[in-house]
Amino acid sequence: SIPWNLERIIPAWQQTEEDSSPDGSSQVEVYLLDTSIQSGHREIEGRVTITDFNSVPEEDGTRFHRQASKCDSHGTHLAGVVSGRDAGVAKGTSLHSLRVLNCQGKGTVSGTLIGLEFIRKSQLIQPSGPLVVLLPLAGGYSRILNTACQRLARTGVVLVAAAGNFRDDACLYSPASAPEVITVGATNAQDQPVTLGTLGTNFGRCVDLFAPGKDIIGASSDCSTCYMSQSGTSQAAAHVAGIVAMMLNRDPALTLAELRQRLILFSTKDVINMAWFPEDQRVLTPNRVATLPPSTQETGGQLLCRTVWSAHSGPTRTATATARCAPEEELLSCSSFSRSGRRRGDRIEAIGGQQVCKALNAFGGEGVYAVARCCLLPRVNCSIHNTPAARAGPQTPVHCHQKDHVLTGCSFHWEVENLRAQQQPLLRSRHQPGQCVGHQEASVHASCCHAPGLECKIKEHGIAGPAEQVTVACEAGWTLTGCNVLPGASLPLGAYSVDNVCVARIRDAGRADRTSEEATVAAAICCRSRPSAKASWVHQ
Amino acid sequence: QDEDGDYEELMLALPSQEDSLVDEASHVATATFRRCSKEAWRLPGTYVVVLMEETQRLQVEQTAHRLQTWAARRGYVIKVLHVFYDLFPGFLVKMSSDLLGLALKLPHVEYIEEDSLVFAQ
């Protein structure tokens, strides 16, 4: 007797697991910034503390009638989705509510900022267990709201936000666009993007994952024993906040970076029909629906990686795009992608003490994306080995010459805008294991890393016939760290990682008579961490 | 996730004759003014004045007080609604948009953001 949404996010084998301490309580506290709530509702009674925080704008309209049940509707439902006894995700979790939205569901950036500051103050006055902050609200892009989220996240608080219900790029809204926030889009019972009237869930690179957000049954503020369904990215975010609370209850030491990586790793992949999203957003939007990950005792120690896309560079000749990893993560590789194919490649460079992935647009190009592969690996130490462009002569191999360092990624760029030169740097596992090989005029950058027990190998897949993309996946137990396209007869658009799959995109010349030498190859660097072993390059 | 979204960023400068009246604020404003790209969501008249990250708590209060003093000199009443220092240094102020140019020239100011609406999702 479990609603569809709970069945979807909590796998059957986990539904009997005890996710609260023996007395049914939880060490994790969830802060909800929303409307007022009906704390006496049967679903949440005894679980909710209504703080004295209230920072809302006046309701619009002179004849607006404040009906308590309507004022409490949104917040009560979400509190129930997070921790409700019958319809909640994290049933034992205690929740604190802050009122930042009025009876019409409207609030202000300033009110939200003051709410976030209130949480920080509470944390300083009375330090407690892990904190999760649920932000089921969205406004236009706000630099200061994003900054406040970043600062709170740096204190160890996990923030979960609604992607927004505007059927638009989530990067245009805050707090959804804040990199430190876990941003959640909404899917329905068929795992498809939620449509809400003429609008629907937001999408794009600022969305971390999707979660159930259509017809979600939960507490209704109409009476203390009333239930109703509501839809939206708020409901989706509440599911993820509940999952995060359960994860932290099992393992309070999990960091934001670990939580995000594990949510991504254990999500259900490739079930969303991407045709619902605008064409230019499909590649940027994650095709994954949240599920509760198993405990770290069962799955600890593995190499965790995610793909981070930059904003689009824009079309100017010298435009660049920059993708950044979270502070705790290591940038293991950098690639680039351009829909027109006109790009000058990519490189890893240091900005303000942090390694970033930079992609370079070319003359006549419509713009590029930088694609960073951001990984979590204990005691990892990476460096970049550069070889400047060879003006003439043979291809220049770049390898990891430091002891126990292995190749995790290759980047390359051209100073000149010569599209023919984009017969790109080559990775060749058979002949030159663990080397990046560059053509003339390309600067080559090898990402070389050392970590206890880190081992890597190259896996390639080529297609000789006409194709728009070639893919290669790392097998079970291995994690994709680097992805490159080795072009055949056609112009490469670039390469990027989708979960554990390396996607090489090309503009097909339509020639079906290619020889295997001309085949377009997707080359993946697959790594794994075996703490007992020494760092090594696996010869295939 | 995002560097700078679809945002309005404006550089505001005071008229030159005003500069002479402002002793400490006579330097050119390097701070920027930002507001929501969606006009209907803007809340003109309320602004978050964001100060440089390393600004001390006392300096935040001094900056807010200085703005009040300068505004009063010009016949404007402004109201400091909230002072921030736990997550970022800054203050929330209710004032005429006429004073934005002046506020941008205050020492320690990184940028000023006009308040805007957020909505339940």
């Epitope: 007797s1 049967r42 009674e45 006894r85 209704s220 109409d222 024993t225 009333c226 239930y227 | -």
Partner: antibody, heavy 117, light 107 residues
């Protein structure tokens, strides 16, 4: 599998007392409100009382408030109904039920109580 | 107490027919209404909660609708195993109260 098993009912004299119990299994007992509902043979259903998760809050049919007490032992997963000053109109099949979404989603098989001299 | 009225004690139908049973509350109960099925010698079985939500495992020929004071329970195509007594019950405020029941029988 969720199971609710009521204790044996029986025949009792008017004015006497009787305590019904209901043993729950297959679910976390302390996570649910529990209720008693009765049904006079060939008649409709009548809600008797319910109790919250930890037993701190109870509600009764007004006419039974002074004579019936609902209680629970979460350590033993048992729900009780203490009935006193029984009357012939209390003759019925008594069901123990679990409440979910404030409706009664699982019911026991029922136990028959007859009050007669 | 809130009084729940099921105006038909009996309803005659044929197999494959669509049948609707109504229930009226003496005051507004929002959507806090459940429907149960009881067969002779058996305990009641929850079919619908909160007026329109089908309980897990309940066939989709059973639907509920309504809010406030007027509610309807519908069987889209009556099967032999649907012959039973159907009760509505409000869970808006205690004491919970049931309707008198509607017995579904074959013409």
């Amino acid at each position: 599998e969720v199971k609710l098993v009521e204790s044996e009912g029986g025949l009792v004299q008017p004015g006497s007392s009787m305590k019904l119990s209901c043993t729950a299994s297959g679910f976390t007992f302390s996570d649910y409100y529990m209720a008693w509902v009765r049904q006079v043979p060939e008649k409709g259903l009548e809600w008797v009382a319910n109790i919250n998760y930890d037993g701190s809050n109870t509600s009764y049919l007004d006419s039974l408030k002074s004579r019936f007490i609902i209680s629970r032992d979460n350590a033993k997963n048992i729900l009780y109904l203490q009935m006193s000053s029984l009357k012939s109109e209390d003759t019925a099949t008594y069901y123990c039920a679990r409440e979910k979404f404030a409706a009664m989603d699982y019911w026991g098989q029922g136990t028959s109580v007859t009050v007669s001299s | 107490d809130i009084v729940m009225t099921q105006s038909h004690k009996f309803m005659s139908t044929s197999f494959g027919d669509r049948v609707s049973i109504t229930c009226k509350a003496s005051q507004d109960v929002s959507n806090a209404l459940a429907w149960y099925q009881q067969k002779p010698g058996h305990s009641p079985k929850l079919l619908i909660f909160s007026a329109s939500y089908r309980y897990t495992g309940v066939p989709d020929r059973f639907t509920g609708s309504g809010s406030g004071t007027d509610f309807t329970f519908t069987i889209s195509s009556v099967q032999a195993e649907d012959l039973a007594v159907y009760y509505c019950q409000q869970h808006y405020s205690t004491p919970w109260t049931f309707g008198g029941g509607t017995k579904l029988e074959i013409k």
